[in-house]
C-alpha cells in the first residue's frame, strides 16, 4: 500500500481551508477524547479510478468519495481520518484531512474525495472514513466502512495499467487445444514479441474429479525475433490411463518483467460426452472378441512425451 | 503481553449449535482483521472465516458458508464464530489467529475443542 | 479455487541434514505465501512470510524462496527441535487455503 507520488495532496474547497496529512493511523482523540463529536460520514463510495505518476506510470487508485451528514455537529468536525486496510496483508496507510477553518452550512451538500491510494490488482481493501475528532469510548461510532475489490489483470481497464503490464497482462496467447486421439493433444498458441521461453503445463483429471491423474511439463525455448507473434504448436503425448480424459493445459511464460511470476493463460479439454442412449445391442452375439490394439493402463509412456514447431 | 483466549468450546449433537468467542489483549484489537483457523484430530490445518477491522469484508471457507457467522465486537477486544447445523466433520480444535502486517498469522490462541457427535 | 499441494507428506533425516520442503498452488500467488511449524499438541507458529521473509525469533537455519507457483522451505541443519509438521498458507486472496502439512521426524 502506497499513496501515489508524493506531490502536494489537496483537500481544501471553497469555503474551507483543508491540509493532508500522513497519519500513523491513531489520531490523537483516541488518547485525548473529547466530549463534542462530530457524526458519522454519509453516502461513502469506493471506486476504481486510475492516476498517471510523474514517471508515466498508470496505476490503479481507489477513489474514496463521501458527504457530510446536515446536523449542527458539522461545527465540532476537525478533519476526517482516511484508512485502506489491505485484507490479505493486513497492512493499513491512513491519511488525516485536517480542516485548518471550521466549517459552515450552505445550501449544497459538503462533499469530500480522495484518489491517492495505489491499490494493488486482485486485491480486497477495507476503506474507513473517520471523521475527527473521534468518538469517547462508549459513544456512537463516527466512521464508515466499505470494502473495496480490485479487479485483476484480466479486466480491460486493468491490463493497460504499469503493474499488469509488468506481468505479461498485454500477452494474449489465443490458446487452442485439441484431442488428436486418445493419447495426443495438440496446442496451439501465440508467441509474445520477447525472446523468452515458454512452458506448458499438462494437468490431466479424471471426468468429475479434482485430484490430477496425469501431469506433464513442456518446456518451449525462446523463438527468434522472425517468430514473434507467430503461431506455435505443440503435440503433448498423453498417458492412456482410462478416465484421465479432462486435460488443462496452462501456458506459462517467463517474460522479463515478471520471470516466474508472470500471468499464466489456461485452457481445458472437457472429456468427451458420454451417449445418452445406450448403443442396441446386436441380435446376434460374435463369435470371437474384437482385440484391442492397447491395454487401458500402459506404463511404458509415465512421462509423456511432445514434439512442437512454429508457424509464420 | 499479546494474547488471544479462545472459549465457547464443547460437545454438540449433529445439527446442534455452539458459538465459540476469542477474548483479545495486549495489541490494538481494533486495527486486524481476524481469523478462525480449525484442525481435525490427527489432520492438517483448515482456514475457516476471517473478518476484516470494521466487519465490512467476511469471507468463509465452502464447507462452512451458510453455516457458521463470523463476527467481532471492537469494543469488547472479542471475535465470535457462531456454528449452526453443526456435522460430524465439524469436531476440530478451533483456533483464532491474527494475522501478520505483512502477511501470515503470527498471534494464535490455545484453542478451543468442538466435538460434534449422536 | 486455488489447491495447495506439499511434498513430500513426511521425510526422515539426520541431525544436521538439509531438508527441504516444497509447496506448489495450482495458479500463481505472487509471493504471498507463509509457512508454519506445529509441533505435536501445540498451536502453529509462523516461520516465514511473503514467501521469504524469515518471521522475528526464528532460527536463521530456516528460509523460504520461490514466487508464483512453486515455493520451498529449507532446514538447512536439521534439529532435533524442527521435529514438527510443516505447513504451507496461500493468502493472495480468500479463501486462504493451506496445503496438508509434511510431518518432519528425525532418523
Known amino acids: 500500500l502506497r499513496l501515489l507520488d508524493h506531490r502536494a495532496l489537496v483537500c481544501s474547497q471553497p469555503g474551507l481551508n483543508c491540509t493532508v496529512k500522513n497519519s500513523t493511523c491513531l489520531d490523537d482523540s483516541w488518547i485525548h477524547p473529547r466530549n463534542l463529536t462530530p457524526s458519522s460520514p454519509k453516502d461513502l463510495q469506493i471506486q476504481l479510478h486510475f492516476a498517471h505518476t510523474q514517471q508515466g506510470d498508470l496505476f490503479p487508485v481507489a477513489h474514496i468519495e463521501w458527504t457530510l451528514q446536515t446536523d449542527a455537529s458539522i461545527l465540532y468536525l476537525e478533519g476526517a481520518e482516511l484508512s485502506v486496510l489491505q485484507l490479505n496483508t493486513n497492512e493499513r496507510l491512513c491519511v488525516k484531512f485536517q480542516f485548518l477553518s471550521m466549517l459552515q452550512h450552505h445550501r449544497k451538500r459538503w462533499r469530500f474525495s480522495f484518489s491517492h491510494f495505489v491499490v494493488d490488482p486482485g486485491q480486497e481493501y477495507e476503506v474507513t472514513v473517520h471523521h475527527l475528532p473521534k468518538p469517547i469510548p462508549d459513544g456512537d461510532p463516527n466512521h464508515q466502512s466499505k470494502n473495496f475489490l480490485v479487479p485483476d489483470c484480466e479486466h480491460a481497464r486493468m491490463k493497460v495499467t504499469t503493474p499488469c503490464m509488468s506481468s505479461g497482462s498485454l500477452w494474449d496467447p489465443n490458446i487452442t487445444v485439441e484431442t488428436l486421439d486418445t493419447q495426443h493433444l495438440r496446442v496451439d498458441f501465440t508467441l509474445w514479441n520477447e525472446s523468452t521461453h515458454y512452458q506448458i503445463l499438462l494437468t490431466s483429471f479424471p471426468h468429475m474429479e479434482n485430484h490430477s491423474c496425469f501431469e506433464h511439463m513442456h518446456h518451449i525455448p525462446a523463438p527468434r525475433p522472425e517468430e514473434f507473434h507467430q503461431r506455435s504448436n505443440v503435440t503433448l503425448t498423453l498417458r492412456n490411463l482410462k478416465g484421465c480424459c479432462r486435460h488443462q493445459v496452462q501456458i506459462q511464460p517467463f517474460f522479463s518483467s515478471c520471470l516466474n511470476d508472470c500471468l499464466r493463460h489456461s485452457a481445458t479439454v472437457s472429456c468427451p460426452e458420454m451417449p445418452d442412449t445406450p448403443e442396441p445391442i446386436p441380435d446376434y452375439m460374435p463369435l470371437w472378441e474384437p482385440r484391442s490394439g492397447s491395454s487401458d493402463y500402459k506404463d511404458d509412456d509415465d512421462k509423456g512425451s511432445s514434439h512442437h514447431h512454429h508457424h509464420h | 503481553e499479546v494474547q488471544l483466549v479462545e472459549s465457547g468450546g464443547g460437545s454438540v449433537q449433529p445439527g446442534g449449535s455452539l458459538r465459540l468467542s476469542c477474548a483479545a489483549s495486549?495489541?490494538?484489537?481494533?486495527?486486524?482483521?481476524m481469523n478462525w483457523v480449525r484442525q481435525a484430530p490427527g489432520k492438517g490445518l483448515e482456514w475457516v472465516s476471517i473478518?476484516?477491522?470494521?466487519?465490512?469484508?467476511?469471507h468463509y471457507a465452502d464447507s462452512v458458508k451458510g453455516r457458521f457467522t463470523i463476527s467481532r465486537d471492537n469494543a469488547k477486544n472479542s471475535l465470535y464464530l457462531q456454528m449452526n447445523s453443526l456435522r460430524d466433520e465439524d469436531t476440530a480444535v478451533y483456533y483464532c489467529?491474527?494475522?501478520?502486517?505483512?502477511?501470515?498469522?503470527?498471534?494464535w490462541g490455545q484453542g478451543t475443542t468442538v466435538t460434534v457427535s449422536s | 479455487d486455488i489447491q495447495m499441494t506439499q511434498s513430500p507428506s513426511s521425510l526422515s533425516a539426520s541431525v544436521g541434514d538439509r531438508v527441504t520442503i516444497t509447496c506448489r498452488a495450482s495458479?500463481?500467488?505472487?509471493?504471498?505465501l507463509a509457512w508454519y511449524q506445529q509441533k505435536p499438541g501445540k498451536f502453529p507458529e509462523l516461520l516465514i512470510y511473503?514467501?521469504?521473509t524469515l518471521q522475528s525469533g526464528v532460527p536463521s537455519r530456516f528460509s523460504g524462496s520461490g514466487s508464483g507457483t512453486d515455493f520451498t522451505l529449507t532446514i538447512s541443519s536439521l534439529q532435533p527441535e524442527d521435529v514438527a509438521t510443516y505447513y504451507c498458507?496461500?493468502?493472495?486472496?480468500?479463501?486462504?487455503?493451506f496445503g496438508p502439512g509434511t510431518k518432519v521426524d528425525i532418523k
Open positions: 489467529a491474527r494475522p501478520k502486517v505483512g502477511g501470515g498469522m503470527d498471534v
Open positions: 495486549g495489541f490494538t484489537f481494533s486495527s486486524y482483521s
Open positions: 473478518i476484516s477491522s470494521r466487519s465490512s469484508i467476511i
Open positions: 495458479q500463481g500467488i505472487s509471493n504471498y
Open positions: 511473503a514467501a521469504s
Open positions: 498458507q496461500k493468502y493472495n486472496r480468500a479463501p486462504f487455503t
